[in-house]
Interface confidence: low
Amino acid sequence: NIDVCKLGTVTVQPAPVIPLGSAANISCSLNPKQGCSHYPSSNELILLKFVNDVLVENLHGKKVHDHTGHSSTFQVTNLSLGMTLFVCKLNCSNSQKKPPVPVCGVEISVGVAPEPPQNISCVQEGENGTVACSWNSGKVTYLKTNYTLQLSGPNNLTCQKQCFSDNRQNCNRLDLGINLSPDLAESRFIVRVTAINDLGNSSSLPHTFTFLDIVIPLPPWDIRINFLNASGSRGTLQWEDEGQVVLNQLRYQPLNSTSWNMVNATNAKGKYDLRDLRPFTEYEFQISSKLHLSGGSWSNWSESLRTRTPEEEPVGILDIWYMKQDIDYDRQQISLFWKSLNPSEARGKILHYQVTLQEVTKKTTLQNTTRHTSWTRVIPRTGAWTASVSAANSKGASAPTHINIVDLCGTGLLAPHQVSAKSENMDNILVTWQPPKKADSAVREYIVEWRALQPGSITKFPPHWLRIPPDNMSALISENIKPYICYEIRVHALSESQGGCSSIRGDSKHKAPVSGPHITAITEKKERLFISWTHIPFPEQRGCILHYRIYWKERDSTAQPELCEIQYRRSQNSHPISSLQPRVTYVLWMTAVTAAGESPQGNEREFCPQGKAN
């Protein structure tokens, strides 16, 4: 218990608080009749230095004065900023078994005088708020430092408040607790901050302000919006404000937007009409206020009002496409497809689509509504048919979009020329073409259609398509394009009543196939061998297969194999070869080639032709 100090006292010269870099003398004195019993001359006073409760030094070498058995003085230097504890102990040297006994202790604080406070800033929040000022205290003093904020103004107005900083709390803001009213709008006020601690004091420069300089209006509250006649584009924004507000700033944006629409409103009196809203859109609205047109500060933004504008009837034109398949000699299946309207065109939740198929001459009409984006019907193969689709929400329907049903690939003269497909990057394919050479009617538009070449893709997946104006000869397709997958791409040229098409395969990225085709049979017919195979499984193709290669060599031969390269056709799964010797056993295998290279070989089959060779 060093603070009881029954055995003696510890004193510090010049003081327990010293400036950084100064030295101090610490004297430890025993009280009368205290010390080592029987042997006063054996009293040894030692001084121990602690930082954060840890003993860091025994200062026996720093003694500058010693009255044997009674008192000792130690000089301490190089003390670091903050508090250091020194404990004086009595060591009775004749008795080694007993530990030194604490005599007394002292804390020495090392710090600096306060710097003049700077950057004083005062605010009054709202007309009924109180004046609060903050400042920059400068360097940490490491000592308890008192700060006094003084305000003076007209009519002998004076006011002051105090706070202090130490190692647990910081004082750089004070609320004076007084309210400045608008009738003092032209008056000037002066504030000053004074700092004082054990090592000195300092004062800020005076800071002058007016009512308008410091009063920040409260942000507007109770924000609401009324939509005129349930309009999705026009609404009146309303709010509550403090009485003195003359200027408002409104900002609003759709929730997924990154930029605000900004509006300034003078003397709005809590009301403003907005006329350019998007129907069926989630909006965020905020308002700020100011007390004076030219001076003063804007309030903080109000809390957000988030609301959705009402629906309006859809606008825009649906993008329609179709597929035609003959079922038998007098019936065909028409599958209509359309793309969803984007939100700015839908202007609400699309409840259904109205689909119409009409035979132009006989006036036969098939009508239906569907919630899907496709519709299939079987109709007669005779007659000229037209289709129309419109989208409906709770407020109405869009204008119907019409398309003539023609034989999409029926007119060879309308087929685009020199169609090519080049991979642009991992998820794009650039399709280019030349116009039909001898079209007897004008091309109204091109349709680029694509579908993954995988089993069942025609029945399972709707096509993807792009409409291209007649003067464009290229399209960058990206929707649903994945790397290492082969797509069938068709370019349709459409006139008023006819269609022509050209087809090509393409991929956005390719690798050599994982495996080669699997030879399933080798048969001999009319002195020719027919090799039959199964195609490589779709996931192992890794792009568009350009060629198959059939390899053969005599069994046990070390010579290079012969090969036959055949153009890849999806429908083809056999091929003849005719350069093999009869009654010689051959080993045959196949590989597949993409633009990235050749696959490993497929299975090997042995075969010995029996017939007469060519």
């Epitope: 121990l48 602690f50 409760d53 840890v54 003993l55 030094e57 025994n58 530990p99």
Partner: nanobody, 122 residues
Framework: QVQLQESGGGEVQAGGSLRLSCVAS????????TGWFRQAPGKERELVAG??????YYADSVKGRFTISRDNAKNTVYLQMNSLKPDDTAVYYC?????????????????RGQGTQVTVSS
Amino acid sequence: QVQLQESGGGEVQAGGSLRLSCVASGRTFSVYTTGWFRQAPGKERELVAGMSGTRTYYADSVKGRFTISRDNAKNTVYLQMNSLKPDDTAVYYCAERRYGGPSLVWDEYDYRGQGTQVTVSS
């Protein structure tokens, strides 16, 4: 008379771990401070870790790698040493004080062990 006995030293590769134990016998009091010191050849003895009540102290050179802990039921204090470096090679001593918190000064400790050798090779 309190006696302290260290164990757990030995040779280990850099990056390895050791756990030193210090068993106290003959103690009749329970309030104490324990320090683990080390002394490398030609260097001063230094405090690497201290424990007083629930408060711990670590030298900067071992912070985050060494952990001091106590099992009162077994009268044992441990020093878990991880990510050992060749610089950690030294004789490690355990010491106890009956009065005061951890001290950097070896002479301030009332009871001291004989030490255990720790060698870290690269």
